[in-house]
């Protein structure tokens, strides 16, 4: 069971990143699915290595003082969502913006029907060029 | 099937990084090989988690305006190369240069005879000290 | 065999990071253990994907000129410790400090009784907020 999906620019104002089965994507079988273009949902309980990579372009003057934060989050059936992993990068002083990349990854127990998704502080800063931003998992 | 190889400084002007089976490297068996010091080639079709880490040292004034970009690339038999993953980091203002590290990783389907390699915008900026720059894969 | 442990602030002045089985941690069975809150120790020989993520907050003026370095290290029975992976990030000019995240990961052969741990140049700069700093492994 494995998946690797590709970032998709979205007109939605939500902080949850959108993904697509496009380009050189992976969706090994129907035991993992991409739901609503925003979350990877698994049918089988078990340990999964889950990862995300986010490239973004920001400028210190044009952004809030808070850093750019990417969060890997879990929504289990009947539970509130929770943060599994986070990474933070202070905005660049480069103009018009400076690119930076964040990588998150870890081993987590998922229940049947559990979904994982990626949240960022400012989706408008995310880079969607080939290979820059992606999200996936594999069952151990 | 798994491999982990270590960066090697190269006098070549190519943007493709060079690797070696040295230090604490891994080469599990002959189903994965390091070819020409530049690419990991697999004999078996299947899903692989492929990763690379690149540490580099650059300075904004001494570099081009474009960021430092590391790309994980795929060359399948009878196909042109393609980008699987990219990460970008804007150059530092630190002098003489500021170190930064990039990590790339994802799950991809590889065909028999497929090769993966790492491309960077400026190989002369890559750090080859112990543990700083490495490349590997594992078959799921 | 898999583990994922969560960073713990420590009053110790050691450069070795401290970890805990808290929050959404993973400890699959007793073939991997967290020893002294500082190292993951495995009972079985084999290939392991080992990873760490460290988020830190630093300022160029308040820090030494040397970059922030995170090292993934190995201590095998009867051997001196050795560096497996390192990542470096130059300090930010943001005030009071600028957050940055480092991710390390690779495939390594571990002997029975081998331990892996994470070393940083300045543990006081490490961010311990939810999900920011973690450490884990999985047996292939």
């Amino acid at each position: 069971i494995a998946a690797h999906v590709i970032s998709e620019a979205s007109s939605k104002t939500t902080s949850v990143l959108q993904w697509a089965e496009k380009g050189y994507y992976t969706m090994s079988n129907n035991l993992v699915t991409l739901e609503n273009g925003k979350q990877l949902t698994v049918k089988r309980q078990g340990l999964y290595y889950i990862y995300a990579q986010v490239t973004f372009c920001s400028n210190r003057e044009a952004s809030s003082q808070a850093p750019f934060i990417a969060s890997l989050c879990l929504k289990s059936p009947g539970r509130f969502e929770r943060i599994l992993l986070r990474a933070a990068n202070t905005h660049s002083s480069a103009k018009p913006c400076g690119q930076q990349s964040i990588h998150l990854g870890g081993v987590f127990e998922l229940q049947p029907g559990a979904s994982v998704f990626v949240n960022v502080t400012d989706p408008s800063q995310v880079s969607h060029g080939t290979g820059f931003t992606s999200f996936g998992l594999l069952k151990l | 099937i798994a491999a982990h190889v270590i960066s090697e400084a190269s006098s070549k002007t190519t943007s493709v990084l060079q690797w070696a089976e040295k230090g604490y490297y891994t080469m599990s068996n002959n189903l994965v090989t390091l070819e020409n010091g530049k690419q990991l080639t697999v004999k078996r079709q299947g899903l692989y988690y492929i990763y690379a880490q690149v540490t580099f040292c650059s300075n904004r004034e001494a570099s081009s305006q474009a960021p430092f970009i590391a790309s994980l690339c795929l060359k399948s038999p009878g196909r042109f190369e393609r980008i699987l993953l990219r990460a970008a980091n804007t150059h530092s203002s630190a002098k003489p240069c500021g170190q930064q590290s990039i990590h790339l990783g994802g799950v991809f389907e590889l065909q028999p005879g497929a090769s993966v390699f790492v491309n960077v915008t400026d190989p002369s900026q890559v750090s080859h000290g112990t543990g700083f720059t490495s490349f590997g894969l594992l078959k799921l | 065999i898999a583990a994922h442990v969560i960073s713990e602030a420590s009053s110790k002045t050691t450069s070795v990071l401290q970890w805990a089985e808290k929050g959404y941690y993973t400890m699959s069975n007793n073939l991997v253990t967290l020893e002294n809150g500082k190292q993951l120790t495995v009972k079985r020989q084999g290939l392991y994907y080992i990873y760490a993520q460290v988020t830190f907050c630093s300022n160029r003026e308040a820090s030494s000129q040397a970059p922030f370095i995170a090292s993934l290290c190995l201590k095998s029975p009867g051997r001196f410790e050795r560096i497996l992976l390192r990542a470096a990030n130059t300090h930010s000019s943001a005030k009071p400090c600028g957050q940055q995240s480092i991710h390390l990961g690779g495939v390594f052969e571990l002997q029975p009784g081998a331990s892996v741990f994470v070393n940083v140049t300045d543990p006081s700069q490490v961010s311990h907020g939810t999900g920011f700093t973690s450490f884990g492994l999985l047996k292939l």
């Epitope: - | 493709v16 790309s71 009878g78 042109f80 190369e81 | -």
Partner: nanobody
Framework: EVQLLESGGGLVQPGGSLRLSCAAS????????MIWVRQAPGKGLEWVSI????????YYADSVKGRFTISRDNSKNTLYLQMNSLRAEDTAVYYC????????????????WGQGTLVTVSS
């Protein structure tokens, strides 16, 4: 909308040099191989040179090997053809084209091309 705009053609003496450029837009340039083709007066299309998506592999027709060099700058979405030691038989309209798929063995497999730039080699 895919657009390819060639420039750099002109009149040059035998043995001279020219550098052609092709500015690309409307597609993800770095994902595609690119090709230069030419059409001499009264003749059919002839492929000249191909460059792979990342510029790591180049291919040349026998008639130009050793004299022409293809290159690309993915950061600028631009394709180039450096033409040295030009001969009268190189006189043609030169077109840049976008390769249609990822197979590296079909040298005529292109789907979009520009309006062309005329190269005349004459004394």
């Amino acid at each position: 909308e895919v657009q390819l705009l060639e420039s750099g053609g002109g009149l040059v003496q035998p043995g001279g040099s020219l550098r052609l450029s092709c500015a690309a837009s409307g597609f993800t340039f770095m994902e595609y191989a690119m090709i230069w083709v030419r059409q001499a007066p009264g003749k059919g299309l002839e492929w000249v040179s191909i460059i792979s998506p990342l510029g790591l592999s180049t291919y040349y027709a026998d008639s130009v090997k050793g004299r022409f060099t293809i290159s690309r700058d993915n950061s600028k979405n631009t394709l180039y053809l450096q033409m040295n030691s030009l001969r009268a038989e190189d006189t043609a309209v030169y077109y840049c084209a976008k390769y249609q798929d990822s197979s590296d063995s079909q040298y005529t497999n292109f789907d979009y091309w520009g309006q062309g730039t005329l190269v005349t080699v004459s004394s």
